[in-house]
């Protein structure tokens, strides 16, 4: 089971109108550049076999991947939103740094790996898709971690 006290984000993180709006604007800008509408990265399949108490830990993994492998490499694009949203998401990642689960997390890593593989397979368009789904990342983090 997760060390649940550490797998928590305060509700106030998701109640800041300005940065929330910027996050959603960034997602919209990127989704307009996303031609591959047949693929969904963040959806029901991501959570398959993952209990409610493990979902924040899963979303931490997705957040970290999105920051390191998508947002940092694409940081020159989608300005001015990117320069504001990346530090916000990095702060959330930092707050989840002590979120771990005890025991086997193979089922979680398997699901996250599928997402990573899809992004990598699609190349730059996979990165654009991941940015276009930042609204879903935001909502999934909110639901899983508060």
């Amino acid at each position: 089971a997760p060390i649940s006290s550490h797998c928590r984000l305060d509700k106030s993180n998701f109640q800041q109108p300005y940065i929330t709006n910027r996050t959603f604007m960034l997602a919209k800008e990127a989704s307009l550049a996303d031609n591959n509408t047949d693929v969904r990265l963040i959806g029901e399949k991501l959570f398959h076999g993952v209990s409610m108490s493990e979902r924040c830990y899963l979303m931490k993994q997705v957040l970290n991947f999105t920051l390191e492998e998508v947002l940092f490499p694409q940081s020159d694009r989608f300005q001015p939103y990117m320069q504001e949203v990346v530090p916000f998401l990095a702060r959330l990642s930092n707050r989840l740094s002590t979120c771990h689960i005890e025991g086997d997390d193979l089922h979680i890593q398997r699901n996250v790996q599928k997402l990573k593989d899809t992004v990598k397979k699609l190349g730059e368009s996979g990165e654009i898709k991941a940015i276009g789904e930042l609204d879903l990342l935001f909502m999934s983090l909110r639901n899983a971690c508060i």
Partner: antibody, heavy 119, light 107 residues
């Protein structure tokens, strides 16, 4: 082409039961959340229930909780609504609709099936 | 539950008019708002999702705006086919909830 076809509506007496079906085609049914929405004669739209693609999560409106069960058979591309302890206020056209996930709109709707609860 | 309040409930307009319908949520729903068009005896059709994205097949004269609690649907130049009832719907949280509808009539 996406198609959703509801069936099973009809006249039922108060306290009675009915099972509605929705046959889906033209898309990967198991990938989609499915919802039932109803519309009483001359009234607005009221969401009734939803079920996840796997069938593992279900959601209900307070007005029907305990009287209605949503289910699906992905092998048959079918959605169901089991209704019991029916009341006159349940009289409505019942639509099935699909939405990819939790944060997705209802992008396709069936034509609906009329349920009339009357003595 | 999130309450959705739509206004006006009835709207009379002429061909070529610019028409605006508003929808207010009882709490913040980010951009998780859809607009549907319904004609008598027919199922609703999706027009707008994520508050401002045009659904596939929806005419470009329809546009949506807003975020948080206040949203609008605009028809830039009313066409004969647009006389119908319009509903907003939030999908930020279950239970999904609809506005009461706006009936658009010919003046």
């Amino acid at each position: 082409e996406v198609q959703l076809v509801e069936s099973g509506g009809g006249l039922v007496t108060p306290g009675g039961s009915l099972r509605l079906s929705c046959a889906a085609s033209g898309f990967t049914f198991s990938d989609y959340y499915m919802s039932w929405i109803r519309q009483a004669p001359g009234r607005g739209l009221e969401w009734v229930s939803a079920i996840s693609g796997s069938g593992g999560s279900t959601y209900y409106a307070d007005s029907v909780k305990g009287r209605i069960t949503i289910s699906r058979d992905n092998a048959k591309n079918s959605l169901y609504l089991q209704m019991s302890s029916l009341r006159s206020e349940d009289t409505a056209v019942y639509y099935c609709a699909r939405g990819l996930w939790v944060w997705d709109p209802l992008d396709y709707w069936g034509r609906g099936t009329l349920v009339t609860v009357s003595s | 539950d999130i309450q959705m309040t739509q206004s006006p409930s009835t709207l009379s307009a002429s061909i070529g008019d610019r028409v605006t319908i508003t929808c207010r949520a009882s709490e913040g729903i980010y951009h998780w708002l859809a607009w549907y068009q319904q004609k008598p005896g027919k199922a609703p059709k999706l027009l707008i999702y994520k508050a401002s994205s045009l659904a596939s097949g929806a005419p470009s004269r329809f546009s949506g705006s807003g975020s948080g609690t206040d949203f609008t649907l605009t028809i830039s130049s009313l066409q004969p086919d647009d006389f119908a009832t319009y509903y907003c719907q939030q999908y930020s949280n279950y239970p999904l909830t609809f506005g009461g509808g706006t009936k658009l009539e010919i003046k």
